[in-house]
């Protein structure tokens, strides 16, 4: 009689994570008597997956009834496949022996590859805010996918970015993989409403890529521009001085008026107007009682934005001139009033 052969018809199979994998194995003879065992891998480190005679293998079921006398089908089904199950599976016939069974013949092996979806990409930006014209780095990470082939793209407001570096780890064979990418983005003053998108495409996603986003509003700081103007008011001894704080982001802003270098008043921005580009404007004003001053007054509007060093603009208020004769287009400069703001 021809010697028993162990036939594993499938050289390889691919299964999605969470599904079941069926590993086929048949033998060509009932002789010699002895059990079948399934292993993953070869060599001394091979792992026992199923033993026909003993052991507890909760995820493994046999396709055929192995108790039937003439059974020659030793196929198994492994449930709830995970990337950790990837590898080559061998169906091995043992010859009955005493006290131990002896390995008789092995099948050629079936390579099981597991398709596992990447996790949702997580995009993170720099720890500290940056100002327009600066280049900032964003990172994108996704984990747990298999096979290794994956495509990652970066976009800013729908426009694809080209300045990025991507690594897939580990470099060698693994049950699953991770991707890590760093993109460089140049900020502009208009980026408060901008978004950076990391897009990951993988065979398991059926052409519907996963996306992770970061809002540049979390990253950008647009410093304000300051303009100080003065206008006469009805009362002949009063001048209204305004400090226009324009196009800043984020909202956090504190303004201090100084009169000849001395702090007159400090206020925190409250009622802001928002521009279309997402930046904010704010105006502070005060009434200066000209008759209370003998000499010219240097008024300074000092603004501390988002914890950054203060910026300021000064305005010289000429006391000698009659308020009504002073035009509204005098040199810009923050004014510090001794009177409360209107």
């Amino acid at each position: 009689e021809e010697e028993l052969q162990v036939i594993q018809p499938d050289k390889s199979i691919s299964v999605a994570a969470g599904e079941s994998a069926t590993l086929h194995c048949t033998v060509t003879s009932l002789i010699p008597v002895g059990p079948i065992q399934w292993f993953r891998g070869a060599g001394p480190g091979r792992e026992l997956i199923y033993n026909q005679k003993e052991g507890h293998f909760p995820r493994v079921t046999t396709v055929s009834d192995l108790t039937k006398r003439n059974n020659m089908d030793f196929s198994i089904r492994i449930s709830n496949i995970t990337p950790a199950d990837a590898g080559t599976y061998y169906c091995v016939k043992f010859r009955k022996g005493s006290p131990d069974h002896v390995e008789f013949k092995s099948g050629a092996g079936t390579e099981l590859s597991v398709r596992a979806k990447p996790s949702a990409p997580v995009v993170s930006g720099p720890a500290a805010r940056a100002t327009p014209q600066h280049t900032v780095s964003f990172t994108c990470e996704s984990h747990g996918f298999s096979p290794r082939d994956i495509t990652l793209k970066w976009f800013k407001n729908g426009n694809e970015l080209s300045d990025f570096q991507t690594n897939v780890d580990p470099a060698g064979d693994s049950v699953s993989y991770s991707i890590h990418s760093t993109a460089k983005v140049v900020l502009t003053r208009e980026d408060v409403h901008s978004q950076v998108i990391c897009e990951v495409a993988h065979v398991t996603l059926q052409g519907d890529p996963l996306r992770g986003t970061a809002n540049l509003s979390e990253t950008i700081r647009v410093p304000p521009t300051l303009e100080v103007t003065q206008q006469p008011v009805r009362a002949e001894n009063q001048v209204n001085v305004t400090c226009q704080v324009r196009k800043f982001y984020p909202q956090r802003l504190q303004l201090t008026w100084l009169e000849n270098g001395n702090v007159s008043r400090t206020e925190t921005a409250s009622t802001l107007t928002e521009n279309k580009d997402g930046t904010y404007n704010w105006m502070s004003w005060l009434l200066v009682n000209v008759s209370a001053h003998r000499d010219d007054v240097k008024l300074t509007c000092q603004v501390e934005h988002d914890g950054q060093p203060a910026v300021s603009k000064s305005h010289d208020l000429k006391v000698s001139a009659h308020p009504k004769e002073q035009g509204s287009n005098t040199a810009p400069g923050p004014a510090l009033a001794s009177a409360a703001p209107l």
């Epitope: 060599g43 001394p44 480190g45 022996g97 006290p99 131990d100 002896v102 390995e103």
Partner: antibody, heavy 122, light 107 residues
Framework: EVQFQQSGTVLARPGTSVKMSCKAS????????MHWVKQGPGQGLQWIGA????????TYNQKFKGKAELTVVTSTSTAYMEVSSLTNEDSAVYYC???????????????WGQGTLVTVSA | DIQMTQSPSSLSASLGERVSLTCRAS??????LNWLQQEPDGTIKRLIY???SLDSGVPKRFSGSRSGSDYSLTISGLESEDFVDYYC?????????FGGGTKLEIN
Amino acid sequence: EVQFQQSGTVLARPGTSVKMSCKASGSTFTSYWMHWVKQGPGQGLQWIGAIYPVNNDTTYNQKFKGKAELTVVTSTSTAYMEVSSLTNEDSAVYYCTRSFYYSLDAAWFVYWGQGTLVTVSA
Amino acid sequence: DIQMTQSPSSLSASLGERVSLTCRASQDIGSRLNWLQQEPDGTIKRLIYATSSLDSGVPKRFSGSRSGSDYSLTISGLESEDFVDYYCLQYASSPFTFGGGTKLEIN
């Protein structure tokens, strides 16, 4: 009781070969992989390779491929290792040990031979 | 290959003291780590398998543990026969690799 009896001390000339043995007793020889480990003088341990007596399947540490050759004689439950083209670097104690026919934690390198000392000298 | 970095390479301690030896794996080896003891005459004995399982006949003062990629052998209450060499061994992936060893010396 499981025991490994290794062959005695060898003094060999550079360029020659030595073949040492490890005889197993107390269990089924064919249910285990037989491993060989090298320990140079005052040095640590290095895994050389292993052989499976059932089908003479071997696996080697790349560093020892072409240097060591593993064989078995199942009828006498004996594993052999031949070390060829001897140099001073091969002067060491060589140990045999075993692991189960699949990766069973409790069966990895439990039992060890007493070691064979090989001295290479002109 | 997986590198096993064992520390310290030598350690002086007193009788009754508690000591810990550590092996760091360069790649994931799960729990597939043994601790071996080598006597001055070359005799090798396994103390711990699968990171923390104590071999039969090994005194309970020996214990194994893991924290991430660091694997430790702790001997609580050193006795005179403990002052020998110790090695860790990973059997997760071929080629199987050993730590460089720790020589435990009496103070």
